[in-house]
């Protein structure tokens, strides 16, 4: 670091004074130099380091009419916003000729009521549930002692008595407010006031109670609430990604969601307007007079199949001697699951109902006993699924085949024997 | 005799701009922080910012950040206030005004001792 | 920022009257506080620098004290020029701020 020579006298005729304040104080160091001749650039030094970005000024005033005559020169270095970094010891420099000279010092410090480095924030959290709080402060002067306060109450008997920079809550059962006074030989700084709203816990044990193709009846267990009674809960059911699923974790479904409410108690809902057999993700959240839990995972579950809801459409049946054709169209209506095939019964005049099941396919041909003398046979047709048959199609008669109306050649279905089983559609 | 005349004053639409002078004389720019204050009448006065003219530095208030900048020309011994993006708001007579520096090796804050005569600036459509 | 607030903001006196102003800061500012006195239509005079200096070639029968966060202007014995708005400012932090203004008008 440059240090002053003492060859010769010092030019140095105002030296910098002190300052001491608290952080955000404004301030300006000054020093007076004579010199003779061309008057020099002034420097500034904090503990002995040149600072190469100084706010300063610099002033000259000539004392007489010559170059050569004595200046005044004044320099001027600015404080804008005091910090702990800023203080230290200040001098002024100057080269003069081959000499270095430095003023006498002055001294920057930092005094003042104690400054938070960190204040409690304001947060939710669930009623009953444990959480920490965090309050740090600084001097000088230290040292500083922490004092917190739950709704304007102190928590110790006095600063420093306990705890310090974190606050360990166990749990609130209403919102409260938190703040931490800083105590030092100045004074007293008081923090910002944290509200901590409590909210419901999550609820917990979401499950299905019963199913149904287009409703699902679920349950859950409430959290507890603190002195807040629950005053709804919200379900969201939404239609799983094929093959993506929603993780467990996933804050938000893909698409937007089926949001229905329930009055507690009870803590049941019944959901409907679903699709049958269709795999759904549903969670519930629970909201109080101070705000709605956190959601519950996502519970993956699905509707069941149902029968469909219509019958097999546009039936046709012709007769040609002792054969039938009969074919049809899948039900327009909503099939409410998998479609595993058709059943169709005949049945004619004075004869038993036929019954078969046909499977996949959409037309039959349909071997029939004796000369084919029955008379007003008659055809009905259902489709099912895995929940069942739908419903049976209205019965259409038997048509006579005329030449030259088309004829599809159909594998042969002989008739069983016996019926597997009667239906009293007639 | 210490002396700091404003001038470059005058309506402007807002949105526009404005470049104000603060031309000083019997002392030099470069010993002293010039700041920039104006006044409204119902606003009382208001500081705008300030400059190092020797060193270039700048300070300001928030009101104006982005929108104003302080320059000084120490071989002209003026300092400029140019103002873009002016609103309604803005409307004021603007001062330039000299710190004191009188007051031993320290001193905590500052005062105005010089202030310019004022120049109005009116922002209106 | 620190808020300064000048009471009152206007007063009538007389010739002669003592006259007091008052301005509170909303955070301790030591002495960082200036006076100044502003006529219609001119700039703004300093009187007081530092809450108790009184700036060279302004007249005695101002005064200036207070420290912390109350400050008092005082005019011994109002004279005709001293009629205008006097305002109060800080300086310990930065942005400095302005008192609002006291209007002290001829009663």
């Known amino acids: 670091a440059p240090r002053g020579t003492q060859a010769e006298e010092s030019p140095f005729v105002g030296n910098p004074g002190n300052i001491t304040g608290a952080r955000g104080l404004t301030g300006t160091l000054r020093c007076q130099l004579q010199v003779q001749g061309e008057p020099p650039e002034v420097h500034w030094l904090r503990d002995g380091q040149i600072l190469e970005l100084a706010d300063s000024t610099q002033t000259q005033v000539p004392l007489g009419e010559d170059e050569q005559d004595d200046w005044i020169v004044v320099s001027q270095l600015r404080i804008t916003s005091l910090q702990l970094s800023d203080t230290g010891q200040y001098q002024c420099l100057v080269f003069l000729g081959h000499q270095t000279f430095v003023s006498q010092p002055g001294y920057v410090g930092l005094e003042g009521l104690p400054y938070f480095l960190e204040e409690p924030e304001d947060r939710t959290v669930a009623a009953n549930t444990p959480f920490n709080l965090s309050c740090q402060a600084q001097g000088p002067p230290e040292p500083v002692d922490l004092l917190w306060l739950q709704d304007a109450v102190p928590l110790a008997t006095a600063p420093g008595h306990g705890p310090q920079r974190s606050l360990h809550v166990p749990g609130l059962n209403k919102t409260s407010s938190f703040s931490c006074e800083a105590h030092n030989a100045k004074g007293v700084t008081t923090s910002r006031t944290a509200t901590i709203t409590v909210l419901p816990q999550q609820p917990r044990n979401l499950h299905l109670v019963s199913r149904q193709p287009t409703e699902l009846e679920v349950a859950w267990t409430p959290g507890l609430s603190g002195i807040y009674p629950l005053t709804h809960c919200t379900l969201q059911a939404v239609l799983s990604d094929d093959g993506m699923g929603i993780q467990a974790g996933e804050p938000d479904p893909p698409e937007e969601p089926l949001t229905s409410q329930a009055s507690v108690p009870p803590h049941q809902l019944r959901l409907g307007s679903l699709h049958p057999h269709t795999p759904y993700h549903i969670r519930v959240a629970c909201t109080s007079s101070q705000g709605p839990s956190s959601w519950t995972h996502w519970l993956p579950v699905e509707t069941p199949e149902g029968v469909p809801l219509g019958p097999p459409e546009n039936i046709s049946a012709t007769r040609n001697g002792s054969q039938a054709f009969v074919h049809w169209q899948e039900p327009r209506a909503p099939l409410q699951g998998t479609l595993l095939g058709y059943r169709l019964a005949y049945q004619g005049q004075d004869t038993p109902e036929v019954l078969m099941d046909i499977g996949l396919r959409q037309e039959v041909t349909l071997e029939l006993q004796g000369d084919g003398s029955v008379s007003n046979l008659t055809v009905c047709v259902a489709a099912y699924t895995a929940a069942g048959d739908g419903p049976w199609s209205l019965p259409v008669p038997l048509e006579a085949w005329r030449p030259g109306q088309a004829q599809p050649v159909h594998q042969l279905v002989k008739e069983p024997s016996t019926p597997a089983f009667s239906w009293p559609w007639w | 005799e210490v002396q700091l005349v404003e001038s470059g004053g005058g309506l402007v639409q807002p949105g526009g701009s404005l470049r104000l002078s603060c031309a000083a004389s019997g002392f030099s720019l470069s010993g002293s922080w010039i700041h920039w204050v104006r006044y409204a009448p119902g606003k009382g006065l208001e500081w705008?910012?300030?400059?190092?003219?020797?060193?270039?530095?700048?300070y300001y208030a928030d009101s104006v950040k982005g929108r104003f900048t302080i320059s000084a020309d120490t071989s002209k011994n003026t300092a400029y206030l140019q103002m873009n993006s002016l609103r309604a708001e803005d409307t004021a007579v603007y001062y330039c005004a000299r710190e004191y520096s009188g007051w031993g090796g320290s001193s905590v804050g500052y005062a105005m001792d010089y202030w310019g005569q004022g120049t109005l600036v009116t922002v209106s459509s | 920022d620190i808020q300064m607030t000048q009471s009152p903001s206007s007063l009538s006196a007389s010739v002669g009257d003592r006259v007091t102003i008052t301005c509170r800061a909303s955070q301790d500012v030591s002495t960082a506080v200036a006076w100044y006195q502003r006529k219609p239509g001119k700039a703004p005079k300093l009187l007081i620098y530092?809450?108790?200096f009184l700036y060279s070639g302004v007249p005695s029968r101002f005064s200036g004290s207070g420290s912390g966060t109350d400050f008092t202007l005082t005019i011994s014995s109002l004279q005709p020029e001293d009629f205008a708005t006097y305002y109060c400012?800080?300086?310990?932090?930065?942005?400095?701020?302005f008192g609002q203004g006291t209007k002290v008008e001829i009663k």
């Open positions: 400012q800080q300086s310990y932090t930065t942005p400095p701020t």
């Open positions: 705008v910012g300030w400059i190092n003219p020797y060193r270039g530095y700048a």
């Open positions: 530092s809450a108790s």
